[in-house]
């Protein structure tokens, strides 16, 4: 299976909410013994490999933000911990996997990584990740709402705030 990032860059004004999204697709083993562990973390653009470094998102680690469920089951974090930090990760039936960040501040700017790990009998088999950048802007140059720039082309799309 693979992970695709719908947008490689999100530019948002301070105070706005944003939903960063990844989609995982390809041959998914729907056997009872296979589940998927999905999570988010911050990183930096490493010289060797993007997403190799793991940093927390608003003090929450990738363990705090994880979802662990069957192939295309819907799920979301019910952790009070995440919601207290203005975060929620979610996954739908179509392979979309997202994290919503509320009330953005300049400190939220940076590189974000989504990670999907295929688990069989509680042990990892394959892992893939996707990366995207979030720029939070303030002042007169800031957009009025979040703008997302697609990964595959230079066109931009306005996206509705979560």
């Amino acid at each position: 299976f693979k992970v695709a990032t719908l947008y490689s860059l999100y530019v948002c004004p301070e105070g706005q909410n944003v939903t960063l999204t990844c989609r995982f697709f390809g041959p998914v083993d729907k056997g009872h013994d296979v589940t998927f562990y999905k999570t988010w973390y911050r990183s930096s653009r490493g010289e060797v490999q993007t997403c190799s470094e793991r940093r927390p998102i608003r003090n929450l680690t990738f363990q705090d933000l994880h979802l662990h469920h069957g192939g295309h089951q819907a799920a979301n974090t019910s952790h009070d911990l995440a919601q207290r930090h203005g975060l929620e990760s979610a996954s739908d039936h179509h392979g979309n996997f997202s994290i919503t960040m509320r009330n953005l501040t300049l400190l939220d700017s940076g590189l974000y990584c989504c990670l999907v790990v295929e688990i069989r009998h509680h042990h990892s088999e394959h892992r893939v990740h996707g990366a995207m950048e979030l720029q939070v802007q303030t002042g007169k140059d800031a957009p009025s709402s979040c703008v997302a720039y697609p990964s595959s082309s230079q066109e931009s799309e306005n996206i509705t705030a979560a």
Partner: antibody, heavy 122, light 112 residues
Framework: EVQLVESGGDLVKPGGSLKLSCAAS????????MSWVRQTPDKRLEWVAT????????YYPDSVKGRFTISRDNAKNTLYLQMSSLKSEDTAMYYC???????????????WGQGSSVTVSP | DVLMTQSPLSLPVSLGDQASISCRSS???????????LEWYLQKPGQSPKLLIY???NRFSGVPDRFSGSGSGTDFTLKISRVEAEDLGVYYC?????????FGGGTKLEIK
């Protein structure tokens, strides 16, 4: 401090049913996979069931498959083991245990409860 | 099922001595992802089991460095470099590389 406290153990007749509970505290219960392990009177340990953090995936050995059901209530920080069609060979001390994992890859049971005794006898 | 065989069944030692416990699996427990999921647990009298070693050789936090694990494939060893009174109890190896997960029969460490 991580604490796991089992309850519900009892003396039951063969063919009967019993539900064990394991109350968890001192950690974010919904972030961890959990298992039940039993210890027979001859002190042998046997893995009984495992459930992932969200409760969507369970696994059992053939010896209990179809008779035992592991479940969890993350809102109540509680793990359960529903046992039915009990046999004399199910007589054991039942422990709940928390898994340590990295990215969903379970690699150890690092915390165990004190156990709950189940006796199956006519 | 993977059969885990421990030896000896009973190991009498003097305090301060080195102790060595063997665990053999009926087939290789090297997982397809490259990890070997072999753990060691100690159960002291009247207590529940406690984790000592995971993935063959990694000590769990708080476990003294006199405990060490080694091995690969089908042969594994737990060594205690200088046995202390608090080390007495039954030691179990446990594999989760293949389902069903299986324990060894246990080795009782006792004072000579």
């Amino acid at each position: 401090e991580v604490q796991l406290v089992e309850s519900g153990g009892d003396l039951v007749k063969p063919g009967g049913s019993l539900k064990l509970s394991c109350a968890a505290s001192g950690f974010t219960f919904s972030s961890y996979g959990m298992s039940w392990v039993r210890q027979t009177p001859d002190k042998r340990l046997e893995w009984v069931a495992t459930i992932n953090s969200g409760g969507s995936y369970t696994y059992y050995p053939d010896s209990v498959k179809g008779r035992f059901t592991i479940s969890r209530d993350n809102a109540k920080n509680t793990l359960y083991l529903q046992m039915s069609s009990l046999k004399s060979e199910d007589t054991a001390m039942y422990y709940c245990a928390r898994h340590e994992d990295y990215e969903g890859d379970y690699y150890a049971m690092n915390y165990w409860g004190q156990g709950s005794s189940v006796t199956v006898s006519p | 099922d993977v059969l885990m065989t421990q030896s000896p069944l009973s190991l009498p030692v003097s305090l301060g001595d080195q102790a060595s416990i063997s665990c053999r699996s009926s087939q290789s427990i090297l997982h397809s992802n490259g990890n070997t999921y072999l753990e060691w647990y100690l159960q002291k009298p009247g207590q529940s089991p406690k984790l000592l070693i995971y993935k063959v050789s990694n000590r769990f936090s708080g476990v003294p460095d006199r405990f060490s694990g080694s091995g690969s494939g089908t042969d594994f060893t737990l060594k205690i470099s200088r046995v202390e009174a608090e080390d007495l109890g039954v030691y179990y190896c446990f594999q989760t590389s293949h389902v069903p997960w299986t324990f060894g029969g246990g080795t009782k460490l006792e004072i000579k």
